[in-house]
Every structure is written in structure tokens, then in C-alpha cells.
């Protein structure tokens, strides 16, 4: 039978690698069965994740799955980092697993690193 | 039922590449991870890397870096790990295992593929 | 890169005994979201490995009762309350809190 608590499926050490200046959405895919929970985003600063008020989010749905997104429109060499989404529901908090973004500052990079680049290079990212 | 399919054993001249792969069923590659892992005659476990068939991002060992290539078709649920400038020390069985990315709720393994690097 | 030890090795045991292996890992492997990400995998003579053990303490679907895993932070056991035939193998912990993952060297299990 299938579980009716809330699910947030992000992945354990998931990341994306992305560009200063670029328009980017960080989905927080959540399953739910009634009632769609209250989810918020965080950033994580050391072992504290610190809510991120006043952004631009958005929900979208799909068959199976709601996606909670936070937008960076563009994106900032500070936004560098990981994130967090929680879900209230039932009273109770729900976390996802942390997604971190690596962030390349074009202007130091004369040409777009690849991805895998980008991860295992660290001298190219803020951190 | 869940099953993980790999490549026949493979017998490669040193300097040269081989690809291994990986066919899954059973379940979404994209809610997993995909490891490679191999295992020297007589041997123990010895990780190489990581595939994330969702986007595509890897990470590998540092021993690994730059000569093997982890990759994902989305489309046929297959993972392929390439291994090149092949010596005899890789003489191995290269494994894939698919680990449940979000709450660890399964990892399955695939039986196995042989690769000798013999001259 | 975190050193994952095993003892014993080697681990002859009577059927229906019970039999115990330690891991110890160079570091801790608690991760910054609280748990702790430490398999144990057992491989048969001619076979692939299998995970029975997720989670330090979680057992896999169809892992028998008789296994069990415990311990925290650089300190892990794996239990098996008696020992069948068909539990003869190589057993691995493996952790996947920090990159790279590492495997234990592997305990050989054996039957007396």
C-alpha cells in the first residue's frame, strides 16, 4: 500500500553546477496525497539552515508529483552553496536532503567548464 | 521484477578501452544512483565512481579520474562505465550497483562483468 | 580518504553460533544531516555482492532476522545471532558519507 506521508525527493549529494548571470530553478519535487503541505526553502550556513524569505517561488504540478521552485533570476556568485526543503505537514517538519550549487562566475572563466569539471575542479567555484 | 543486466566478459590488449554496460529494470534509474565497483582476482571491493541518471553528474575516485567515464541512457534505463589506457592491473569484475537516491531504500547489484587486459 | 578496518579476517565459525564483525572507519561518518551512511554488503563464494545492511542498523527486504547491524560515528558491528550454511562469504562494510566511498578489506566467514 502505498505511503501516505509527504515525500521530498531530492537526492543525498545531489548538486548542479551552473553559471553566474544565468536564469536557474531549483525543484523541490514533494508527494502528497490530500492535502498539498506548506514547503519552504533554506540555505544552509554550517549546521543551520537559514529559511529564504522573500524569494520568488513557484509550484508546478505533474501526474504523480508537485515541484516546489525557488528561481534565481539570474543567478549570483553568492547563491553558491546548499539548500534545503522542508514541508510542514501535520504538524510536523519534513526535510529534504541538502542540494548544493556550484557556481562559476563567468567573468573568471574564459570558457564554460563541463559539469564534471566544474565538480571535481573546486578552485573554479565560490565557496 | 528488479534486475540488473550487464555486458559479457571482455578480453583487452593493454593501452586499449573498454566499455562495460548496464541494462536495469524494475525500477526508475532516475530515482537511483549507479556505482561501478570493481574487483581484482582474489580481491576486495574497490569503488570507482558515481553516475546521477536525472542530470548526468558524476564523481569519481581520484585514482579514476580522467581515465574512466561513467554515463546513463535515460531511455533505455542502461549505465555504462568505459575504462581507458587499460593495463593488467585492471584485469578485474567490474560490477554496476543502483542505490535508491532519496531514502536508501534499496541497492541492488548486477552479477558482474569480466575484463582481462592481457598482451 | 576515510580507511575502513575490518576484524577479524578470517572468521571460522560453528553452525548455529554466533558470529561477529568489527568495522572501524578513520573518521566519523555521520553526515551533516544527521545520519549515519554505513553498509554492510555480504558476497557468496562465486557470487556478487548483496547489501543486507543500510543506515548502520537497517536491514534490506529478505535479509534474515539472524543479521543485524549497530555502532556510530567510527565504530560499527555486524551480528549474526547463528550461523547457517548459507551464510558462508565475504562480508564488507562500506560507507557513503564521504567521497570517495571505501570498502573494509572483507571478513571471510567459515564454517568449522
Known amino acids: 500500500k502505498e505511503s501516505c506521508d509527504v515525500q521530498l525527493y531530492i537526492k543525498r549529494q545531489s548538486y548542479h553546477s551552473i553559471f553566474a548571470g544565468d536564469p536557474f530553478k531549483l525543484e523541490c519535487p514533494v508527494k502528497y496525497c490530500a492535502h498539498r503541505p506548506q514547503v519552504t526553502w533554506c540555505k544552509l550556513n554550517g549546521t543551520t539552515c537559514v529559511k529564504l524569505e522573500g524569494r520568488h517561488t513557484s509550484w508546478k504540478q505533474e501526474k504523480n508529483l508537485s515541484f516546489f521552485i525557488l528561481h534565481f533570476e539570474p543567478v549570483l556568485p553568492s547563491d553558491n552553496g546548499s539548500y534545503r526543503c522542508s514541508a510542514n505537514f501535520l504538524s510536523a517538519i519534513i526535510e529534504s536532503h541538502s542540494t548544493t550549487l556550484y557556481v562559476t562566475d563567468v567573468k573568471s572563466a574564459s570558457e564554460r567548464p563541463s559539469k564534471d569539471e566544474m565538480a571535481s575542479r573546486p578552485w573554479l567555484l565560490y565557496s | 521484477q528488479v534486475q540488473l543486466v550487464q555486458s559479457g566478459a571482455e578480453v583487452k590488449k593493454p593501452g586499449s578501452s573498454v566499455k562495460v554496460s548496464c541494462k536495469t529494470s524494475?525500477?526508475?534509474?532516475?530515482?537511483?544512483?549507479i556505482h561501478w565497483v570493481r574487483q581484482a582476482p582474489g580481491q576486495g571491493l574497490e569503488w570507482i565512481g558515481r553516475?546521477?541518471?536525472?542530470?548526468?553528474?558524476?564523481k569519481y575516485a581520484q585514482k579514476f579520474q580522467g581515465r574512466a567515464t561513467i554515463t546513463a541512457d535515460e531511455s533505455t534505463s542502461t549505465a555504462y562505465m568505459e575504462l581507458s589506457s587499460l593495463r593488467s592491473e585492471d584485469t578485474a569484475v567490474y560490477y554496476c550497483a543502483s542505490y535508491e537516491g532519496y531514502y536508501e531504500r534499496f541497492g541492488y547489484w548486477g552479477q558482474g562483468t569480466l575484463v582481462t587486459v592481457s598482451s | 580518504d576515510v580507511v575502513m578496518t575490518q576484524s577479524p579476517l578470517s572468521l571460522p565459525v560453528t553452525l548455529g553460533q554466533p558470529a561477529s564483525i568489527s568495522c572501524r572507519s578513520s573518521?566519523?561518518?555521520?553526515?551533516?544531516?544527521?545520519?549515519?551512511?554505513l553498509n554492510w554488503l555480504q558476497q557468496r563464494p562465486g557470487q556478487s555482492p548483496r547489501r543486507l545492511i543500510y543506515l548502520v542498523s537497517k536491514r534490506d527486504s529478505g535479509v534474515p532476522d539472524r543479521f543485524s547491524g549497530s555502532g556510530s560515528g567510527t565504530d560499527f558491528t555486524l551480528k549474526i545471532s547463528r550461523v547457517e550454511a548459507e551464510d558462508v562469504g565475504v562480508y564488507y562494510c562500506?560507507?557513503?558519507?564521504?567521497?570517495?566511498?571505501?570498502f573494509g578489506q572483507g571478513t571471510k566467514l567459515e564454517i568449522k
Open positions: 524494475g525500477f526508475n534509474i532516475k530515482d537511483t544512483y
Open positions: 573518521q566519523s561518518l555521520l553526515d551533516r544531516d544527521g545520519k549515519t551512511y
Open positions: 553516475n546521477d541518471p536525472a542530470n548526468g553528474n558524476t
Open positions: 562500506w560507507q557513503d558519507t564521504h567521497f570517495p566511498y571505501t
